[in-house]
Amino acid sequence: GSTVPPMVNVTRSEASEGNITVTCRASGFYPWNITLSWRQDGVSLSHDTQQWGDVLPDGNGTYQTWVATRICQGEEQRFTCYMEHSGNHSTHPVPSGNSHHHHHHHH
C-alpha cells in the first residue's frame, strides 16, 4: 500500500508532586516502521527513561504506538516528541495545561 503519515498526539497527566507524565501517541500510519522518542533539549532521552508501547494494528489497515516519559513540572518546553516515518520527521511539543495537541505530519 501507499505510505500514510501518522497523526501525532501529545498529552500530559499528573504523575506525582512536581512531576508529570508526557505521552506521545502516533496513529493511523503505514507502513508499521516508525521512530518515536522523547527528546530533552533536542537530544534523545536514553531508552531506560522512556516507556514504549508495541506497534499494533488499529483495525483500519494502519498502525498505532506510543512513548511516554516522566518529567519535572515547569520544564515542559525543554521536551519534544520526535517522530520519524518513511523518511519524514517532525517534532511535537508538550501542550501547556491539560490541552491536547493533534496534527497530521504532512510530506
Epitope: 530533552q40 533539549d41 536514553s46
Partner: antibody
Framework: DVHLVESGGGLVQPGGSRKLSCAAS????????MNWVRQAPEKGLEWVAY????????YYADTVKGRFTISRDNPKNTLFLQMTSLRSEDTAMYYC????????????WGQGTLVTVSA | QIVLTQSPAFKSSSLGERVTMTCTAS???????LHWYQQKPGSSPKLWIY???NLASGVPARFSGSGSGTSYSLTISTMEAEDAATYYC?????????FGSGTKVEIK
C-alpha cells in the same frame, strides 16, 4: 557571567589514565546538559561525550566508548571526564561545553585543557 | 553515524564579497538539530547560528543560515575582516553527535 574552567590536562603515557574536571559558575549547573568536545592540534572539532542534567542520558563518540566516562557532581557544579587506555590520537585540547536548553547546541565553551599522550 | 561534509575546505575572499559555504549530511537530519560555530586561531569556538537559521547573540546580521534535509549552508552577505575564521557545522539529530571538518575563510 557563565564561566567554565577545565583542569587536569598534561602529559600522559600511552595506556595511562587521566581525569579532567570542569568547574562551572554563573548558571544553575544542575539544570543544563554538558559535553566534552576535543580538538587535536591543527585539526577540527570532535564531540566526545554528552551528559544530561540528571545524569540519566549519556552518549559517547565511538572513538572513546568503553575508555572514557563522563560524569557530574551537581552540588559541586563540576563536570568530569575520566579517560583510560589513552592513545596518541587522544592528544587534543579538551573543551567543556554547556548544552543550550530547548534548542540544543554548545552555547558556552571553556578555554580548554591540553592532554598530550606520548612516551 | 551521520557524516557532515563541508565545502569548500578553504575560501579566500575579498572584503565586501558574498561568501557561501555548505554542509552536506550523509542522511537527512531535522533542521532543528543543525548548528554552526565560528572559531578563530587560539580561541575557543563560539555558537554562531543555531537551529539552521537563527543567529546567536551578538552575531552580525550579514550572516545567515538555511537548509533542510541533507543540505545546509552559511552565507556572509558582505565579507568583513573580522569574519576571517573557521566555521564548523554540527548535528545532534542522532548520536553520536558529529561536526563537519570545517571551512576556513581568509581575507584575499
Amino acid at each position: 557571567d557563565v564561566h567554565l574552567v577545565e583542569s587536569g590536562g598534561g602529559l600522559v603515557q600511552p595506556g595511562g589514565s587521566r581525569k579532567l574536571s570542569c568547574a562551572a559558575s554563573g548558571f544553575t549547573f544542575n539544570t543544563f546538559g554538558m559535553n566534552w568536545v576535543r580538538q587535536a592540534p591543527e585539526k577540527g572539532l570532535e564531540w566526545v561525550a554528552y551528559i544530561n542534567s540528571g545524569s540519566n542520558t549519556i552518549y559517547y563518540a565511538d572513538t572513546v566508548k568503553g575508555r572514557f566516562t563522563i560524569s557530574r557532581d551537581n552540588p559541586k557544579n563540576t563536570l568530569f571526564l575520566q579517560m583510560t587506555s589513552l592513545r596518541s590520537e587522544d592528544t587534543a585540547m579538551y573543551y567543556c561545553t554547556r548544552w543550550e536548553p530547548v534548542t540544543g547546541g554548545f552555547s558556552y565553551w571553556g578555554q580548554g585543557t591540553l592532554v598530550t599522550v606520548s612516551a | 553515524q551521520i557524516v557532515l561534509t563541508q565545502s569548500p575546505a578553504f575560501k579566500s575572499s575579498s572584503l565586501g564579497e558574498r561568501v557561501t559555504m555548505t554542509c552536506t549530511a550523509s542522511s537527512s537530519i531535522s533542521s532543528s538539530y543543525l548548528h554552526w560555530y565560528q572559531q578563530k586561531p587560539g580561541s575557543s569556538p563560539k555558537l554562531w547560528i543555531y537551529t539552521t537559521s537563527n543567529l546567536a547573540s551578538g552575531v552580525p546580521a550579514r550572516f545567515s543560515g538555511s537548509g533542510s534535509g541533507t543540505s545546509y549552508s552559511l552565507t556572509i552577505s558582505t565579507m568583513e575582516a573580522e569574519d576571517a575564521a573557521t566555521y564548523y557545522c554540527h548535528q545532534h539529530h542522532r548520536s553520536p553527535f558529529t561536526f563537519g571538518s570545517g571551512t576556513k575563510v581568509e581575507i584575499k
